[in-house]
């Protein structure tokens, strides 16, 4: 016997669709090696129509896959628009031939049944309404009308025209007629469940002169739709209820064995499990809603139903959709860290991964909001100014080509731990999650700026230096100006020679900034921070304020404000000074990626790291934790 | 209350032919597969057939002992389904019971573990004579 397994018989009809799925045993050698689906000829040969390593033949051409789910040792070959030539008998198997381990698979296809002349078929999905149409003569016109339910050995009424109504029906059943037309009467049933599935008679009159008409009701659980995401992207159940339901409140749920529990709704209900990585966007007037989830695990598998109901629970004769998610760990979006850990006054260099094929695409970070619906307003973009309560703390660096850009945010709160989405206006499974955690800071910071009190004088030289401790000494030490369109970073040069690497004086590591002269133009923020290659690390804020030569003048002293921007990481010991006029930014990027257009985005997410130390459990220290100011003199 | 109810067992001759019926039943209960296993004595309950069903497509699996002697249908309504036994031995002698899925995961989970179906009957005995 083969140790392969799947289904022996497979029986659909034209135009609809199959999944077949094959199981293998559990070996490295068979979760890697090849599979494939062929068609058994006459003479014995398997001809190959779909394998694993990219083949795909002429005839299955736009309307075949296969997946391998090695964590389940499985593989599916999914085929659409099926015809009757698709008849036959096939294998599904491994290995690098046709000869290989497998399994044979019969495949019958057959045409859309032909039905009775004499019955009418109602087809309706669970929770719709249908309206039967009986027609009559018009000499029953006066002659009572009904709809009755055939069951075993009679008919059981659901409605008649004398208004009695099974109580099963009460509430969901009419019997009307439209306008002047005598000749037809029609029946309205609303919520249809299971149950109602079957056989029901109108009539009109009794007798042998009675008008009668057979009708067969079908009422079909919605087919599940087939969703394959990577771990670690996103999905976006697009949920389309109808505009009898536009006023009810939505809710998206996972069945499991015996219900179906609420995963978010419009309500304000949202589980636990999916806290920071799920948001509900209503659409529009007609029942429309969606529900995006990012950070995709192994165990967001499984069945999901998006239905609408007053209670945002799910109810029996409601109406529904329904998705079968699979969950595919052998993903290419890259494991980063979903937790990224900083303390007050520190900072936290976030990587967040995109599309490499996509670098000129539009990165922005949003944090995510969880009341109401939840959403996600942005809160910085290469083409999105920051937003005005993060002046001078947060900056996005994007290092084209290399598939990662940087988020850093400085001068943190315990207000800023969250979630954060990084996202960009290209392929939308990358969109990525990562959880701030702020601890209270309890040792001093990694970088210091002196003097603290930073107040330079119009047309004099002012010089700040940035204190870093010897592990930093072999990154990289920058200093940017930062303005709302990110932190441009300032040309540096050595400030002689280096120390020997091998002894490293704790009070001599600086790097400094020299202004000179000082201009009107030079206030503003100013990041001292290390890097290593592409790769961010620690950073500490300073404002500098520019005032006139003014005899005995007194100014707001901004201590507080750069006490507070402290961060940390290791990096190279350079002395150097900057000398700098035009501190120009980065191009202005242009619109703003508004809270909406992030809301409605479609598809996928997760976990990041922040760079180097920002985040290690050694990493950082900070000072106050207060929010700052900006300073004006 | 989802209740698998068997009916069918009894005493056959070898070679001779059974046929076994699971009915469910439950308010609101439509399945989306339903299978038979066995246990006989002093051994672990093991697969015998499952059928699958997504709108107008059906998939039937068959364990290896009984392949090209049992084979599983359902009714159109697909709340019953049907356990077909030809040229039964006496190693078929067990008790067999219905198992159903509401819950259509079995794309992704191997219908031959028990572990993974949600409800059970409580079983109709099977006896084959020599």
């Known amino acids: 016997k083969s140790p392969i397994f799947g289904p022996q018989e497979v029986s659909s009809i034209e135009g609809d669709s199959v999944s077949i799925t094959c199981y293998y045993p559990d070996t490295s050698v068979n979760r890697h090696t090849r599979k494939y689906w062929c068609r058994q000829g006459a003479s014995g040969m398997c001809t190959t129509l779909i394998s694993s390593n990219g083949y795909l033949s002429k005839e299955y051409s736009g309307r075949a896959n296969l997946i391998n789910f090695p964590e389940n040792n499985t593989f599916v070959i999914n085929i659409e628009q099926l015809t009757q030539d698709d008849t036959g008998s096939y294998k599904c198997g491994l290995g690098t031939s046709n000869r290989g381990l497998s399994f044979d698979v019969s495949l019958e296809v057959s045409q859309v049944p032909e039905l009775p002349s004499d019955t009418h078929v109602y087809t309706k999905d669970i929770g719709r309404n249908v309206t039967i149409e009986c027609p009559f003569k018009r000499e029953n016109a006066p002659s009572k009308k009904s709809l009755c339910k055939k069951t075993n050995q009679s008919c059981e009424l659901v409605i008649d025209s004398t208004e009695k109504v099974n109580p099963s029906y009460i509430g969901r059943a009419k019997l009307f007629m439209k306008g002047t037309d005598l000749t037809v009467f029609y029946v309205n049933i609303s919520h249809l469940t299971h149950n109602d599935a079957g056989l029901y008679i109108c009539q009109a009159g009794e007798g042998p002169s009675a008008d009668k008409k057979n009708v067969d009701l079908q009422v079909l659980a919605p087919e599940p739709e087939l969703l394959y995401k990577d771990l670690r992207s996103s999905v976006t159940f697009e949920c389309d209820l109808g505009r009898e339901v536009a006023n009810e409140a939505k809710y998206l749920c996972r069945m499991n064995k015996e219900t179906c529990d609420v995963i978010i709704n419009t309500l304000g209900k949202r589980d636990p499990d999916f806290e920071g990585r799920i948001l509900i966007t209503p659409k529009d007037d007609n029942g429309r809603f969606s529900v995006l989830i990012t950070g995709l695990r192994k165990e967001d598998a499984g069945h999901y139903q998006c239905g609408a109901h007053s209670s945002g629970l799910p109810q029996e004769g409601w109406p529904i959709q329904t998705w079968q998610l699979f969950v595919n760990e052998e993903s290419t979006i890259p494991n980063r860290r979903s937790v990224v850990k900083g303390v007050t006054g520190g900072s936290v260099a976030i990587a967040c991964p995109y599309n490499p094929k996509e670098s000129s695409s539009l990165k922005y970070w949003c944090r995510w909001e969880g009341d109401g619906n939840g959403h996600c307003p942005v809160l910085v973009g290469t083409q999105a100014q920051v937003q005005e309560e993060y002046e001078g703390r947060l900056a996005l660096f994007d290092q084209p080509g290399n598939g990662t850009y940087t988020v850093i945010l400085n001068q943190l709160t315990t207000e800023d731990a969250g979630f954060y989405w990084c996202l960009t206006n290209g392929d939308s499974r990358w969109r990525t999650t990562i959880e701030l955690q702020v601890a209270e800071a309890t040792r001093e910071p990694n970088l210091e700026v002196t003097p603290q009190n930073a107040t330079a004088v119009l047309g004099e030289t002012f010089t700040v230096s940035c204190h870093y401790p010897c592990k930093f000494y072999s990154q990289e030490k920058y200093w940017c100006k930062w303005s709302n369109k990110g932190c441009h970073i300032l040309p540096s040069h050595d400030e002689g020679a280096r120390q020997s690497s091998v002894s490293c004086d704790q009070s001599s590591q600086l790097v400094s900034m020299t202004l000179n002269p000082v201009s009107k133009e030079d206030e503003g923020w100013y990041w001292c921070g290390v890097k290593q290659g592409q790769t961010y690390g620690e950073t500490t804020a300073i404002y500098i304020a520019v005032e006139e030569r003014t005899r005995g003048s007194s100014h707001v002293n901004p201590t507080d404000a750069n006490a507070r921007a402290k961060v940390a990481l290791e990096e190279e010991v350079v002395d150097s000074s900057i000398s700098e006029k035009e501190n120009k930014a980065i191009p202005n990027p242009g619109p703003f990626a508004n809270e909406r257009e992030i809301q409605n985005v479609g598809d996928q997410a997760q976990e990041n790291r922040a760079s180097g130390d920002a985040g290690s459990a050694d990493g950082q220290s900070r000072s106050s934790s207060s929010k700052h100011h900006h300073h004006h003199h | 209350e989802v209740q698998l109810v068997e009916s069918g067992g009894g005493l056959v001759q070898t070679g001779g032919s059974l046929r076994l019926s699971c009915a469910a039943s439950?308010?609101?209960?439509?399945?989306?597969?339903m299978g038979w296993f066995r246990q006989a004595p002093g051994k672990e309950r093991e697969f015998v057939a499952a059928?699958?069903?997504?709108?107008?497509?059906?998939?039937?699996y068959v364990g290896d002992s009984v392949q090209g002697r049992f084979t599983i249908s359902r009714d159109a309504a697909g709340n019953t389904v049907y356990l077909q036994m030809n040229s039964v031995k006496p190693e078929d002698t067990a008790v067999y019971y219905c198992a159903a899925d509401r819950v259509p995961k079995d794309i992704s989970i191997d219908p031959r573990n028990p572990k993974d179906w949600d409800y059970w009957g409580k079983g109709t005995l099977v006896t084959v004579s020599s």
């Open positions: 059928i699958r069903w997504s709108g107008a497509t059906t998939y039937k």
């Open positions: 439950g308010r609101t209960f439509s399945p989306y597969a």
